[in-house]
Amino acid sequence: FTITVSKDLYVVEYGGNVTMECKFPVEKQLNLFALIVYWEMEDKKIIQFVNGKEDLKVQHSSYSQRAQLLKDQLFLGKAALQITDVRLQDAGVYCCLIGYGGADYKRITLKVHAPYRNISQRISVDPVTSEHELMCQAEGYPEAEVIWTSSDHRVLSGKTTITNSNREEKLFNVTSTLNINATANEIFYCTFQRSGPEENNTAELVIPERLPVPASERT
């Protein structure tokens, strides 16, 4: 009796959904009452399917209303765990254990990332010095550095602060400001750069013709 997995690594975005699968040998018909399915993550019990039904009493509270075993897939020999509204804390090594005549288990790794996609931007001007303050802010995971560039590809020196998000403990709130003398219609870019390939998110900031005081906000 051998369980197989088509993927042993799943990468999912924060807030998205994921379905992890373990396949087990099944005859033309399935006897639900002889099937045992456990899904666990470290010390947290997520699914306990015994005697033809899920025992929700043992489910760890952090997965409540978010994790379910897809029953229709069992008849195809698949123990499919679906997690909705994925959180950063969901990342880790999952174990599916299946008893159906024989018994076996497999491990699957879930990685969760949160791109710095929704970048808020603000442009303000100091009425005394006429210096512009450009600000970009976004939440994501893991930590990112912010690179400021001009339209002629010059790298500029900004100041970045990283705090914890109010939304979720593990999310980072990254804010970066650039103080610069600029003229109307000049274009600047803030790029949130995480480790890994193609993990960059960029916002374009255009200096307006005139700025009211107090500073306006553009999103």
């Epitope: 005859e27 033309k28 018909q29 006897n31 002889a34 045992i36 008893g99 159906y100 005549g101 024989g102």
Partner: antibody, heavy 119, light 108 residues
Amino acid sequence: EVQLVESGGDLVKPAGSLRLSCVASGFTFSSYSMSWVRQAPEKGLQLVAWIDAYAGVTSYANAVKGRFTISRDNAKNTVYLQMNSLRAEDTAMYYCARGQGGRSSFDYWGQGTLVTVSS
Amino acid sequence: SYVLTQLPSVSVTLRQTARITCGGDSIGSKNVYWYQQKLGQAPVLIIYDDSSRPSGIPERFSGANSGNTATLTISGALAEDEADYYCQSYDIPLTGTVFGGGTQLTVL
């Protein structure tokens, strides 16, 4: 090499008890379901009892329900059949068989142990 | 409960084809297994999942299953194939195993 060796068969009086044992070797015992199948003299095969590998799920033939109990000790690589309230019609060769990984079939069988119930 | 019906006996001439049938209600929707049992010996699994052969089982043994009948075919039967043959399926998979009554094959 997979081996299943049964023992415990004997001549016993009606209403008596017997405990059959089957010692397994040559495979990871805790990963397979095990069964007892019997064959009365000059008759066909009948599944007596089944136990799954993992959670101790069991199943019995109607003819033995409430009288026979199947159990396993994964540490000792052994499956047992406790037979109580024996009847003449329980007389048979009792085979221990290994489940074929999540299927209803039996891919390895022991040579059997004979149980005779007679006064 | 589920019933599997086999003919008590079948004869075949040496090196001819023997067909042993196993009848059951909608048996084609279930998996069928076949065992060979020689006199004084334990049964041996020769076909599983309708038509698959375990390693070590000669190619002359084949199986098919559809509708209400499963068939074990022995192409070019040999004297050593003389034995009782049992089909097996289930009412409920795993826990509801059912055997046919057995067919005694005689090789002439």
